[in-house]
Interface confidence: low
Amino acid sequence: QFLKEGQLAAGTCEVIAAHRDSSQPRRTIARQTARCACRKGQIAGTTRARPACVDARIIKTKQWCDMLPCLEGEGCDLLINRSGWTCTQPGGRIKTTTVS
């Protein structure tokens, strides 16, 4: 059946707000607010650089790269102490995401 307006399909997320904080020199912090309807055993995370429902085990174990958080063609590496991950683009540019 079709979903009612504003209703999310199980296991999906939608971005409801996004803004950039450029107040810190040399660093841009992008924040997205997402609404997720995750199934049992899932939790809101990031897949292919988009909000997504991911296996809750990933969050517990902090194996962030198992979410496939980076875009296709990018390489993912865990930060020291598993505080987040980096996505390395083919050209070598690195994007770092920390989990607060």
């Epitope: 296996d55 085990r57 979410m67 980076c70 296709e72 390489g75 993912c76």
Partner: antibody
Framework: QEQLVESGGRLVTPGTPLTLSCTAS????????MSWVRQAPGKGLEWIGI?????STDYASWAKGRFTISKTSTTVDLKITTPTTEDTATYFC?????????????????WGPGTLVTVSL | ELVMTQTPPSLSASVGETVRIRCLAS??????ISWYQQKPGKPPTLLIY???NLESGVPPRFSGSGSGSDYTLTIGGVQAEDAATYYC??????????????FGAGTNVEIK
């Protein structure tokens, strides 16, 4: 109800390129990974390849160069670049679902009814 | 390249019996396996994903188990309507290598 329908299957002569299309109802193709699978008469299923929301693709090793998967805003297309008699089969498009475990564990949750391609002289 | 070896190719069972179909992957696929039922002239339908998760609407007599490279589909108390061909699909997507999926050769289940 979420559905897929393939079209474009017909009788072609060897070497004549053919493009199949897959359209969706009940959901938007653009947000999903989509795959093509084929089945020769009386044989098993063969995975051909996958297209991601970004438009990038992965193919089975045997399918590289023989098939091209692309998409528009409303369809996912499969081009059989140089058909041979061995490409005679029913071609299915399938929506890829998945969840994140050790990798993105993929499976097909919705299939089209298939479209028959016959390659013959 | 991933190879999925599915056994047996065919089997015959009586109503109420337990049927088991095995798929052996050529490498560890970390539960990245799904199972499908196909009846003649129809597309496949999803039964099990992630090795052991039952798809919505599928009768609970179907179950999946296994880990590493060895997986099994079990039909407990097989019914006449379960006569069909069953396929496994193995593969996992990694950001580094992309997606590579392989079907097993199929198992034709006949109900006596």
């Amino acid at each position: 109800q979420e559905q897929l329908v393939e079209s474009g299957g017909r009788l072609v002569t060897p070497g004549t390129p053919l493009t199949l299309s897959c359209t969706a109802s009940g959901f938007f193709l653009s947000g999903y990974y989509m795959s093509w699978v084929r089945q020769a008469p009386g044989k098993g299923l063969e995975w051909i390849g996958i297209i991601y929301p970004s438009g990038s693709t992965d193919y089975a090793s045997w399918a590289k160069g023989r098939f091209t998967i692309s998409k528009t805003s409303t369809t996912v297309d499969l081009k059989i670049t140089t058909p041979t008699t061995e490409d005679t089969a029913t071609y299915f498009c399938a929506r890829v679902a998945g969840y994140v475990g050790y990798g993105y564990e993929t499976f097909f949750d919705i299939w089209g009814p298939g479209t028959l391609v016959t390659v013959s002289l | 390249e991933l190879v999925m070896t599915q056994t047996p190719p065919s089997l015959s069972a009586s109503v109420g019996e337990t049927v088991r179909i095995r798929c052996l992957a050529s490498e560890d696929i970390y539960s990245g396996i799904s199972w499908y039922q196909q009846k003649p002239g129809k597309p496949p339908t999803l039964l099990i994903y992630g090795a052991s998760n039952l798809e919505s609407g599928v009768p609970p007599r179907f179950s999946g188990s296994g880990s590493g490279s060895d997986y099994t589909l079990t039909i407990g108390g097989v019914q006449a309507e379960d006569a069909a061909t069953y396929y496994c699909l193995g593969g996992v997507t990694y950001s580094s290598t992309g997606t590579h999926l392989t079907f097993g050769a199929g198992t034709n289940v006949e109900i006596k």
